[in-house]
């Protein structure tokens, strides 16, 4: 097999500190076009399990603004436009990576963090527990 | 407005390099327990707009495994368990941050990248275009 040599342009890291800290370039390569979920689609309004988008802002985190979905109803919207409580609106969650300033207020020192965010809602058949 | 003073314990960074590259601590703080969406909920099966989860794998990215939702039907499942084509199953998308090695083969130098992933599906009323 071929051993890929370490790139000579790599930042140096001593074994005693490695791999606690790495260098991350913040010039983000973005393969997408639009980051605002309200602009990118109106599914949140047209869904049978509609949701509101709440702005979650934290200046000590990157990205500082994350949009969180909150389902509008416990039930789902039926064909008549009414809430049907025989069905449930539930949030779809996704685990995402964020950077948190550490120590706080340091402009160029961060810690990786995983957080769970609600992206939107879907309509599901409820799990019914029958009592004997 | 109040200017938060810079923490005196911050690593040093010259303005000419900031904020291109930052230092990131890899002791990841994980506020969640399980990263596997199949285990965390069965909404993908119980939804009126059910979806399948496909593994998107790239060993040169972190996270290397990302689950992508693909809606099973064009329409939505009605109360009889049949597909109703008067409604549409659509993917809910989320922009997430991932890390990629840069320069390649450097063990501790990375670049942030944004990718768009489909997290699940929701059932929406279609937009009907009437032709005059």
């Amino acid at each position: 097999g071929i051993t890929i040599p370490r790139n000579p342009g790599c930042p140096n890291s001593e074994d005693k500190n490695f791999p606690r800290t790495v260098m991350v370039n913040l010039n983000i390569h973005n393969r997408n076009t639009n980051t605002n979920p309200k602009r990118s689609s109106d599914y949140y309004n047209r869904s049978t399990s509609p949701w509101n988008l709440h702005r979650n802002e934290d200046p000590e985190r990157y990205p500082s603004v994350i949009w969180e979905a909150k389902c509008r109803h416990l039930g789902c919207i039926n064909a008549d436009g009414n809430v049907d409580y025989h069905m449930n609106s539930v949030p779809i969650q996704q685990e995402i990576l964020v950077l948190r300033r550490e120590p706080p207020h340091c402009p160029n020192s961060f810690r990786l963090e995983k957080i769970l965010v609600s992206v939107g809602c879907t309509c599901v058949t409820p799990i019914v527990h029958h009592v004997a | 407005g109040i200017t938060i003073p810079r923490n005196p314990g911050c690593p040093n960074s010259e303005d000419k390099n900031f904020p291109r590259t930052v230092m990131v601590n890899l002791n990841i703080h994980n506020r969640n327990t399980n990263t596997n969406p199949k285990r965390s909920s069965d909404y993908y099966n119980r939804s009126t707009s059910p979806w399948n989860l496909h593994r998107n794998e790239d060993p040169e990215r972190y996270p290397s495994v990302i689950w992508e939702a693909k809606c099973r039907h064009l329409g939505c499942i009605n109360a009889d368990g049949n597909v109703d084509y008067h409604m549409n199953s659509v993917p809910i998308q989320q922009e997430i941050l991932v890390l990629r090695r840069e320069p390649p083969h450097c063990p501790n130098s990375f670049r942030l990248e944004k990718i768009l992933v489909s997290v699940g599906c929701t059932c929406v009323t279609p937009i009907v275009h009437h032709v005059a």
């Epitope: 051993t3 790495v22 | 794998e57 996270p63 290397s64 990629r100």
Partner: nanobody, 119 residues
Amino acid sequence: QVQLQESGGDWVQPGGSLRLSCGASGFTFSSYWMYWVRQAPGKGLEWVAKIKQDGTEKYYVDSVKGRFTISRDNAKNSLYLQMNSLRAEDTAVYYCAKGEILPHYFDYWGQGTLVTVSS
């Protein structure tokens, strides 16, 4: 889903040998560095050994060099750890873990297998 399952842990006397195995599924095993990690009673996690995708590079923590050998069989999606000349301080739960590009960082590891070394 990504799954890792260790086996082979047992009680053994000092100086004895054991062979740990790990079966992997839910990812392309041959595309990742793989690790053995251990946690001694009351201690933190410590990486023990790691092996490159094709098995051509292997690294060990100083305390096990010359005694432990890591290997893999990509055709069987399996990882192994041959442990010789075992010492009391090797007593721990041993986990296999899937490597990531983040150095020594793991998102997935198994349930673990207990190795007890005592007389």
